[in-house]
């Protein structure tokens, strides 16, 4: 999937299987990614688990779990708030569109999470105070935490190189990372479809083009569109909403 | 160890900032400090071996001397409202202030800096 980190770095990651997206003293978010096509290096999110940890007199531990074709509007125990404590309503789930769009507000940590199902796969977006982002017991032992540190270099897909291949008339769009790409999606069509929804040629637009060329699945146009829309709602600095191409950083630079 | 609760209650009580209260706010600030000191003292049994506890104790001592607060005197009333009856329903609007990040954790400073992370597509 494509990842926009807390530090506004943009990466495309292979990260197949279960990976921690957020892991701090208040919250743990884990995603499971699966290949979009057999033999493809590109993956998309098929499962999402969010654990809100027990917090003072506010909330009991609550688990939210979403999978492909199952986007619940409640926590795993059936509740829609933080439990029996006095401050239980400082954690709330709201269903925006049944089976497609859920918003979780964790007021006790100033955090808003948006989970969507777009096509077969899930998208995730979060707004969180820096103080909460950095509330980790031991910075050194936190290991990989994708939203904070980005993906390891060996898990990144260089989609700028991929795009150069795709634009080149001498090479087919099916060049790496996916050996099984539908023939039906020429580069120009992908560009046109993405331009419809994403008029600014930023990295969301580039991600959209990449996804259409990689999968032939038009739902990924919507995924990029909603990711940008969620960014508009959740990003505190509207000037930084659109990210543009730059040389790729090492994962250390993301921390 | 509930020392963090003491910290956040102190921040919540000192809306004009924990480091430089206006001169006319000093009595109120000192009252909040005494409340903070009392709160930390009450956590001593369960926190006394932990760094957070000792940092709070030393921080209180420093702030008391900086603002010439006397050890004895009034304490500030906690802002948390009384708990509802045990049979209260799931719909509660009167959460303690500590359960509202913007009200509690950041009364002592400017609005928090928010960050955004997103994951989508392939």
């Amino acid at each position: 999937p494509h990842l926009r980190t807390f530090t506004d770095h943009f990466q495309t990651c292979k990260v197949q299987g279960a990976w921690p997206l957020i892991d701090n003293n208040y919250l743990n978010v884990q995603v499971t990614n699966t290949p979009v096509l057999p033999g493809s290096a590109a993956t998309a999110t098929s499962k999402l688990t969010i654990i809100f940890k027990n917090f003072q007199e506010c909330v009991d531990q609550k688990v939210y779990q979403a999978e492909m074709d199952e986007l619940p509007s409640a926590f795993a125990d059936g509740s829609k708030n933080g439990g029996d404590k006095h401050g239980a309503n400082s954690l709330k789930i709201t269903e925006k569109v049944s089976g497609q769009h859920v918003e979780i507000q964790a007021k006790y940590i100033g955090t808003t999470i948006v989970v969507r199902q777009v096509g077969r796969y899930l998208t995730f977006a979060v707004r969180m105070p820096e103080e909460v982002v950095n509330a980790v017991e031991d910075r050194d032992s936190q290991g990989l935490y994708l939203c904070l540190r980005g993906c390891p270099l060996n898990q990144q897909i260089d989609f700028q190189a991929f795009r150069a291949n795709a634009e080149s008339p001498r090479r087919p769009a099916a060049a790496s990372p996916s050996p099984v790409v539908p023939e039906t999606f020429p580069y120009e069509t992908a560009v046109a479809k993405c331009k419809e929804k994403l008029p600014v040629e930023d990295l969301y637009y580039q991600a959209c083009v990449f996804d259409l060329l990689t999968t032939g699945d038009v739902n990924f146009t919507l995924a990029a569109y909603y990711a940008l829309e969620d960014g508009k709602m959740l990003h505190s600095n509207k000037d930084k909403l659109h990210l543009f191409e730059r040389t790729r950083e090492l994962p250390g630079a993301v921390a | 160890c509930k020392i963090l609760k003491c910290n956040s209650e102190f921040w919540s009580a000192t809306s004009s900032g924990s480091h430089a209260p206006a001169s006319d706010d000093v009595p109120e600030f000192c009252a909040a400090l005494r409340t903070y000191a009392l709160c930390t003292r009450r956590t001593a049994r369960t926190c006394r071996g932990d760094l957070a506890y000792h940092s709070a104790v030393h921080g209180i001592e420093d702030l008391m001397s900086q603002h010439n607060c006397s050890k004895d005197g009034p304490t500030s009333q906690p802002r948390v409202r009384t708990l509802p009856p045990a049979g209260d329903s799931q719909e509660r609007s009167d959460s303690p202030e500590i359960c509202h990040y913007e009200k509690s954790f950041h009364k002592h400073s400017a609005a928090p800096n928010y960050t955004h992370c997103g994951l989508f597509g392939d």
């Epitope: 031991d138 | 160890c1 003292r41 009450r42 049994r45 006394r48 506890y53």
Partner: antibody
Framework: EVQLVESGGGLVQPGGSLRLSCAAS????????MNWIRQAPGKGLEWIGM????????HYADSVKGRFTISRDNSKNTLYLQMNSLRAEDTAVYYC????????WGQGTMVTVSS | DVVLTQSPLSLPVTLGQPASISCRSS???????????LEWFQQRPGQSPRLLIY???TRFSGVPDRFSGSGSGTDFTLKISRVEAEDVGVYYC?????????FGQGTKLEIK
């Protein structure tokens, strides 16, 4: 994830000495007081002692005072228990636990004092 | 030293039924500030102890809400609303109010 791993247990003769270690990870070790607790075979839990985050204070149970010493090396994220003048009644599983009041515990190491 | 006396020492319970363990202290566990520092630990067979409840009634992170603690002064209770198979083990109360800290002798919960 908080992890505490005790080591150094084994068989020792009465009057002998043993040094137990507890390797900590998953939290900022140097921020927390630490405890040692033991459990004799088939018996209940007995608190042995605790050490402050910076080693400035140590507290011991009367049963081990003067024989056992708790220390720590924050640079190595390790807690120690030096046990001298061991007796048969010191035979137990020894646990280290995080915090002034123990919240997370290690899996324990067995100490057998026997001739 | 403060002596904590648990009862019963053995507690056979039917799955799905409630269970209650008592812990009595030889002196009040209320501190001069009015706080009471009593905790409950669970030790499953072959495992290390795990914190369930602190400050008499506050559940520790990740502890199911079928566990609850109550009491004051010298009398305290741990309740399990519906016993599950994974609840089998020994339960200990632990006081932190007075030095030295002390444990109860343990209550063994088993399934009937």
């Amino acid at each position: 994830e908080v992890q505490l791993v005790e080591s150094g247990g084994g068989l020792v003769q009465p009057g002998g000495s043993l040094r137990l270690s507890c390797a900590a990870s998953g939290f900022t070790f140097s921020n927390y007081g630490m405890n040692w607790i033991r459990q004799a075979p088939g018996k209940g839990l007995e608190w042995i002692g605790m050490i402050y985050y910076d080693s400035s204070e140590k507290h011991y149970a009367d049963s081990v005072k003067g024989r056992f010493t708790i220390s720590r090396d924050n640079s190595k994220n390790t807690l120690y228990l030096q046990m001298n003048s061991l007796r048969a009644e010191d035979t137990a599983v020894y646990y280290c636990a995080k915090g002034t009041t123990p919240d997370y515990w290690g899996q324990g190491t067995m100490v057998t004092v026997s001739s | 030293d403060v002596v904590l006396t648990q009862s019963p020492l053995s507690l056979p319970v039917t799955l799905g039924q409630p269970a209650s363990i008592s812990c009595r202290s030889s002196q009040s566990l209320e501190s001069s500030d009015g706080d009471t520092f009593l905790e409950w630990f669970q030790q499953r067979p072959g495992q290390s102890p795990r914190l369930l409840i602190y400050d008499v009634s506050t559940r520790f992170s990740g502890v199911p809400d079928r566990f609850s603690g109550s009491g004051s002064g010298t009398d305290f209770t741990l309740k399990i609303s519906r016993v599950e198979a994974e609840d089998v083990g020994v339960y200990y109360c632990f006081q932190v109010t007075h030095d030295p800290v002390t444990f109860g002798q343990g209550t063994k919960l088993e399934i009937k």
